[in-house]
């Protein structure tokens, strides 16, 4: 008789999850010499240990501490790029501007990017059928708690000028409920961070509005200012040209506003 299995509202664990995490770790340590000391076997086992045999609605940041310890990494604290609802462009940017880093350019972010995972209480099985949805089921699920944990640590590490890329095509350009709005903004350290600079990315080619005047951006400015951090904002009217100019800053067309 098949054992009753909890049905959650979200998609199940990504297929070949263990193999994917292990392979990503191996690949990352090959590409990043500063992380070559990392033992990927121990990293995978600590990752697995954070959620296996635990109720997938009862995961805590503490569960991920062994993984955090193994994945400890120093990135230049003044070269951090945060993003909200515009991951692809942020990643394209750091692929060109190699001295800047998103969370997914770090080992732990790279391991988990675009993956889903969860286990079941009291069994060593990974649940490939379904996992809890943040809204419909519970917020303390393995994926959400992981990203909350690594995002908090990433924000805490930032210093000097921190950049954030925001999606100007969304109804809420700054969303208080996003990981950026609910975690990262509140964990920037005022004693280390001088300025948060927002880059608002425009979607339409003919969109010439100043989206830095958007009410949600003003709300972000207010939150940041209350935390004794300066705020600045720039419109990126042409993201394609923006990337092109990052690649070729000497190009004559790159002196005008992008």
């Amino acid at each position: 008789v098949p054992r009753w299995r909890q049905q959650w509202s979200g998609p199940g664990t990504t297929k070949r999850f263990p193999e994917t995490v292990l392979a990503r770790c191996v690949k990352y340590t090959e590409i990043h010499p500063e992380m070559r000391h990392v033992d990927c076997q121990s990293v995978w086992d600590a990752f697995k240990g954070a959620f296996i045999s635990k109720h997938p609605c009862n995961i805590t940041e503490e569960d991920y501490q062994p993984l955090m310890k193994l994945g400890t990494q120093t990135v230049p604290c003044n070269k951090i790029l945060l993003w909200s609802r515009i991951k692809d462009l942020a990643h394209q940017f750091t692929q060109v501007q190699r001295d800047m880093f998103t969370l997914e350019d770090t080992l732990l972010g790279y391991l988990a990017d675009d993956l889903t995972w969860c286990g079941e209480f009291n069994t060593s099985k990974i649940n490939y059928q379904s996992c809890p949805d943040w809204r419909k089921d519970c917020s303390n699920n393995p994926v959400s708690v992981f990203w909350k944990t690594v995002s908090r640590r990433f924000a805490e590490a930032a210093c000097d000028v921190v950049h954030v890329m925001l999606n100007g095509s969304r109804s809420k350009i700054f969303d208080k409920n996003s990981t950026f709005g609910s975690v990262e903004v509140h964990n920037l350290q005022p004693e280390k961070v001088q300025t948060l600079e927002a880059w608002v990315i425009h979607g339409g080619r003919e969109d010439s509005r100043d989206l830095c005047q958007d009410p949600t951006i003003k709300e972000l400015e207010s939150i940041i200012s209350k935390r004794n951090i300066q705020f600045s904002c720039k419109n990126i009217y042409r993201p394609d040209k923006f990337l092109q100019c990052v690649k070729n800053p000497e190009d004559s067309s790159c002196t005008s506003e992008i």
């Epitope: 292990l22 392979a23 191996v26 090959e30 990392v38 033992d39 076997q41 995978w44 193994l70």
Partner: antibody, heavy 112, light 112 residues
Framework: SLEESGGRLVTPGTPLTLTCTVS????????MAWVRQAPGKGLEYIGI?????TTYYATWAKGRFIVSKTSTTVDLKITSPTTEDTATYFC??????????WGPGTLVTVSS | DIVMTQTPASVEAAVGGTVTINCQAS??????LAWYQQKPGQRPKLLIY???TLASGVSSRFKGSGSGTEFTLTISDLASADAATYYC??????????FGYGFGGGTEVVVK
């Protein structure tokens, strides 16, 4: 450094525990393994224990061996030795780089 | 479990000559492959890790290449001290469904 001990002559079926004493290695962040080599034969993995403490075994070794550790030692228990388990047993450290540290090995002879 | 197939089992070459040893993995192990030299009564000595990186203190006459599933060790300008058995080794990692650690069967190099 790594140093194996506990190898001796045992009769078939008598459980035997080998101990690897470690110095200068943080066992909470490194994977340790046991490898063996029968006389005149090749090297073979028995099992590993990761920094996190999870154990994995080669298929042929499951149920026949148990790997465990403390903060300074890694043990290998041969649950019910047979004459085929006569070999030199090596304790090794495995990293993402390679199996870079080997103990000198300890000889186990199983004979009636 | 991963299977490492090493060829040839034995090879003979003259001093000053070149020897090539091949190793095939049963699954993609990226560049997580090492080569070892072992002489009778001694523990294995690491020559190459990460498929092509020379271990500290090892002669540049030893060259490793390959990635994925196909790997090669080339020993050039053969010296009498190179007479030994050579092993390839995967250290890719283990999950509950696969054990990615394993050795090839070994290649005995005889120097004339």
């Amino acid at each position: 450094s790594l140093e194996e001990s506990g190898g001796r002559l045992v009769t078939p079926g008598t459980p035997l525990t080998l101990t690897c004493t470690v110095s200068g290695i943080d066992l909470s962040i490194y994977t340790m393994a046991w490898v063996r080599q029968a006389p005149g034969k090749g090297l073979e993995y028995i099992g590993i224990i990761s920094g996190y403490g999870t154990t994995y075994y080669a298929t042929w070794a499951k149920g026949r061996f148990i790997v465990s550790k403390t903060s300074t030692t890694v043990d290998l228990k041969i649950t019910s030795p047979t004459t085929e388990d006569t070999a030199t047993y090596f304790c090794v450290r495995t990293t993402v780089q390679s199996t870079d540290l080997w103990g000198p090995g300890t000889l186990v002879t199983v004979s009636s | 479990d991963i299977v490492m197939t090493q060829t040839p089992a034995s090879v003979e070459a003259a001093v000053g000559g070149t020897v090539t040893i091949n190793c095939q993995a049963s699954q993609n192990i990226y560049s997580n492959l090492a080569w070892y030299q072992q002489k009778p009564g001694q523990r294995p000595k690491l020559l190459i890790y990460k498929a092509s990186t020379l271990a500290s203190g090892v002669s540049s006459r030893f060259k490793g290449s390959g990635s994925g599933t196909e790997f090669t060790l080339t020993i050039s300008d053969l010296a009498s001290a190179d007479a030994a058995t050579y092993y390839c080794q995967s250290y890719y990692g283990a999950t509950s469904s696969s054990f990615g650690y394993g050795f090839g069967g070994g290649t005995e190099v005889v120097v004339k």
